[in-house]
């Protein structure tokens, strides 16, 4: 039951991240007009991935697309390449968990295959989310260094009578948006990867392992105790003894160790 | 069409208090801005303070101690109320919509205020 | 706060004539973001309350002649009327539309000679 929750509560957290993902990648406000220490303007700036955009006070509102793909900092084609990895790393996932989730029945899927499919989209998420967290960063590195260098533009260089006004951008509501959704799409992978471990069938939890005595032939059946250390029991060379017919649920109802994380 | 009217007083004494209104057809206060600017008999135009579309404001430095403007947007009406008026005061009040570039494309025919006691 | 000089104060012209006049600001116009400078330019004649000819320093009002033309950047611009007409006879303003307040220039007076 835990495991089932665990998944379903990575895969709506990792879809919402996504989601905010996509959201932050298509916003325009990726760095806006500082309006602090400035003259009052009537004309607010602001710039996203693709496009920039002037709003007037009278409402007025005006956007120009980056036509040029060679004339764009590489900086900025680095973002957007991050973003994109992201976005497609993450809808990928989102398709994997969707097959994976316990919840739902696929023909005869093995659990061990969902418990492969809920790692892969898990790590995916995982990639997914820094991605985008390492594409907002860079770009908010690159506002901070431009910041500071047209700071010291305002305050050099204005012997003459003619002022210019420096237009200095900060943070904009898509590098915030950015942030928060790369982090949950990262908690959701994290999910993931945890509930998967729960999800892998431990064979020596419900199987009856054959030891041989001289002699003797008894057969033990551990109770709660299990001898394995990996996701799965390595049962190479071991005799294995069903324990008797159960259903796929009883089997799965078994407490693991892993379903209380 | 797009129209704007303004009304006052005409005279007021001086140290008194001033409000004009500005009302305004063919358009919604909630997507315009609306300027006011006076000009003096015989001189140049003096941009006083606007209120912009959502409601806020900015006005002439030298005169934002005495100036407020205000609108009531289910009267398509804007106000201008000045404070503590004396005789340089006396001016034409032209009321004027903001368009692109935050240029004003249509005005008002003006009021003239005269502060004379 | 910014100051917006215009000059001359007055023209003495012909019609037929082309005639330029300028008008200077104390702050740069330019805004870097849509590579457009605020500056306004308005014809007022007698009596009447302005009229807009030309925004973002070169677009003109539609409904203007195109012999009005407007142009520069930053912080000096022109208005230039390629034939004077008798009733272009007026006072022409600039405006900052960039920085607050949004100053007007001096005015300058077009006269017939």
């Known amino acids: 039951m835990a495991v089932t929750a665990c998944q379903g509560l990575g895969f709506v957290v990792s879809l919402i991240g996504i989601a905010g993902i996509i959201a932050a990648t298509c916003m325009d406000q990726w760095s806006t007009q500082d309006l602090y220490n400035n003259p009052v303007t009537a004309v607010f700036n602001y710039q996203g991935l693709w496009r920039s955009c002037v709003r007037e006070s009278s409402g007025f509102t005006e956007c120009r697309g980056y036509f040029t793909l060679l004339g764009l900092p590489a900086m900025l084609q680095a973002v957007r390449a991050l973003m994109i990895v992201g976005i497609v790393l993450g809808a990928i996932g989102l398709l994997v968990s969707i097959f994976a989730l316990k919840c739902i029945r696929i023909g005869s899927m093995e659990d061990s295959a969902k418990a492969n499919m809920t790692l892969t989209s898990g790590i995916m998420f995982i990639v997914s989310g820094l991605c985008a967290i390492a594409g907002v960063s860079v770009f908010a590195n690159m506002l901070v260094t431009n910041f500071w260098m047209s700071t010291a533009n305002m305050y050099t260089g204005m012997g003459g009578m003619v002022q210019t006004v420096q237009t200095r951008y900060t943070f904009g509501a898509a590098l915030f948006v950015g942030w928060v959704a790369g982090g949950l799409t990262l908690i959701g992978g994290v999910m993931m990867c945890i509930a998967c471990r729960g999800l892998a069938p431990e064979e020596t939890n419900y199987k009856a392992v054959s030891y041989h005595a001289s002699g003797h032939s008894v057969a033990y059946k551990p109770g709660g105790f299990k001898a394995s250390t990996g996701f799965g029991s390595n049962t190479k060379n071991k005799k294995i003894y069903d324990g008797g017919a159960r259903t796929e649920d009883e089997v799965q109802s078994y407490p693991s160790k892993h379903d209380y994380v | 069409q797009v129209q704007l009217k303004e009304s006052g007083p005409g005279l007021v004494a001086p140290s008194q208090s001033l409000s004009i209104t500005c009302t305004v057809t063919?358009?919604?206060?909630?997507?315009?801005?609306v300027h006011w600017v006076r000009q003096p008999p015989g001189k140049g135009l003096e941009w006083l303070g606007v209120?912009?579309?959502?409601?806020?404001?900015n006005y002439d430095s030298a005169l934002m101690s005495r100036l407020s403007i205000s609108k009531d947007r289910s009267k398509s009406q804007v106000f201008l109320k000045m404070t503590s008026l004396q005789t340089d005061d006396t001016a034409m009040y032209y009321c004027?919509?903001?368009?692109?570039?935050?240029?004003?494309?249509?005005w008002g025919q003006g009021t003239t205020l005269t502060v004379s006691s | 706060d910014i100051v917006m000089t215009q000059s001359p104060s007055s023209l003495t012209v012909t019609t037929g004539e082309k005639v330029t006049m300028s008008c200077k600001s104390s702050?740069?116009?330019?805004?870097?973001?849509?590579?457009?400078?605020?500056l306004t330019w308005y014809q007022q004649k007698p009596g009447q309350p302005p009229k807009l000819l030309i925004y973002?320093?070169?677009t003109r009002e539609s409904g203007v002649p195109d012999r009005f033309t407007g142009s520069g950047s930053g912080t000096y611009f022109t208005l230039t009327i390629s034939s004077v007409q008798a009733e272009d006879l007026a006072v022409y303003y600039c405006?900052?539309?960039?920085?607050?307040?949004?100053?007007f220039g001096t005015g300058t007076k077009l006269e017939l000679k």
């Open positions: 004027a919509r903001s368009l692109y570039g935050n240029s004003f494309d249509h």
């Open positions: 063919g358009f919604s206060l909630s997507s315009y801005g």
């Open positions: 209120i912009w579309a959502g409601g806020s404001t």
């Open positions: 702050q740069s116009l330019f805004n870097s973001g849509n590579q457009k400078n605020y």
């Open positions: 973002w320093a070169s």
């Open positions: 405006q900052n539309n960039y920085i607050y307040p949004l100053a």
